[in-house]
């Protein structure tokens, strides 16, 4: 599992794979704080649940950032 | 309203080229899949496959592997279905349909999360008739 | 050949009960849910159930879906002539990657 155990940033390496949408339970989505300095994505994989870092520079991943900030900015209060 | 218009299909000669096409309006294209289902005359439907436009990525039945190419264009809000070479058995009724969409939950709070729900094929097109006939 | 069985037809009169099954395998049905589609003649198909058991908004009451183990089954309560059409099971296979479809069942109201 490319997780670290350092309390800066959960990722220690990055899948460049592309993610098949149909093989993800869900994706989480860490922005970028003053203890990891770069937004992270994790992928959850339905089989076996292996979770999986994603690039946050592929143009999937940049296409849904993008969704989710629009998402945010019509539900924010 | 929510819809999707295939377009594109006709009387075509085997061995040629062939694109349909389906528009989408009246939703977020790109937070959906769109599916490409046909129907030969006196047999049922059968999957061809989907694409993902956020994450431009293509799934195909096995049997249509290799034979179509699905693409999506998420300017336009349009899915593509193509043919290189058409057989007189790709005869059928061709519809796109709206099946996956991506859910964004936790959104208000530091660690958003997205699942992408599979509910079934919820919006269909008119479908467009391919005639592979020499 | 179908890689969900359905029945080829299913027949009933005006009021009456008719069940429609679909059978499949443990890498569909057994470990995927099941959706139901209904395909009037000249019209594209619609989702008549999703998730199992759950209807979309606008479909009637009289439809029901449910599934056990490798099986679904659609349960049209209350046969109306308009009823009369194809039905489709499909779900998603696991070994196949892919969306399979039971190869229809023609519902006659007599």
């Known amino acids: 599992v490319p997780l670290s155990r350092t309390v800066r940033c959960t990722c220690i390496s990055i899948s460049n794979q592309p993610v098949n949408p149909r093989s993800l339970e869900k994706l989480e989505i860490i922005p970028a704080s003053q203890f990891c300095p770069r937004v992270e994505i994790i992928a959850t994989m339905k089989k076996k649940g292996e979770k999986r870092c994603l690039n946050p520079e592929s143009k999937a991943i940049k296409n849904l950032l993008k969704a989710v900030s629009k998402e945010r900015s019509k539900r924010s209060p | 309203q929510v819809q999707l218009v295939e377009s594109g299909g006709g009387v075509v000669q085997p061995g040629r080229s062939l694109r349909l096409s389906c528009a989408a309006s009246?939703?977020?294209?790109?937070?959906?899949?769109i599916t490409w289902i046909r129907d030969p005359p006196g047999k049922g439907l059968e999957w061809i496959g989907e694409?993902?436009?956020?994450?431009?990525?293509?799934n195909y039945a096995q049997k249509f592997q290799g034979q179509v190419t699905i693409s999506a264009d998420k300017s336009i809000s349009t899915a593509y279905l193509q043919w290189s070479s058409l057989k007189a058995s790709d005869t059928a009724m061709y519809y796109c349909?709206?099946?996956?969409?991506?859910?964004?939950?936790?959104?208000?709070?530091?660690?958003?999360?997205?699942?992408?729900?599979?509910?079934?094929?919820?919006?269909w097109g008119q479908g467009t008739l391919v005639t592979v006939s020499s | 050949q179908s890689v969900l069985t359905q029945p080829p037809s299913a027949s009933g009169t005006p009021g009456q009960r008719v069940t429609i099954s679909c059978s499949g395998s443990?890498?569909?049905?057994?470990?995927?849910?099941v959706n139901w589609y209904q395909e009037l003649p000249g019209a594209a198909p619609q989702l008549l159930i999703y998730?199992?058991?759950q209807r979309p908004s606008g479909i009637p009451d009289r439809f029901s879906g449910s599934k056990s183990g490798t099986s679904g089954s659609l349960v049209i309560s209350g046969l109306q002539s308009e009823d009369e059409a194809d039905y489709y099971c499909?779900?998603?296979?696991?070994?196949?990657?892919?969306?399979?479809f039971g190869g229809g069942t023609k519902l006659t109201v007599l």
């Open positions: 349909a709206r099946d996956g969409r991506f859910d964004v939950s936790d959104l208000l709070t530091d660690k958003p999360k997205v699942t992408i729900n599979y509910n079934g094929m919820d919006v």
């Open positions: 009246g939703f977020t294209f790109s937070s959906f899949s």
């Open positions: 694409i993902t436009p956020m994450f431009g990525i293509a």
């Open positions: 443990s890498s569909n049905i057994g470990s995927n849910t």
């Open positions: 998730n199992n058991d």
């Open positions: 499909a779900s998603w296979d696991d070994s196949l990657n892919g969306r399979v």
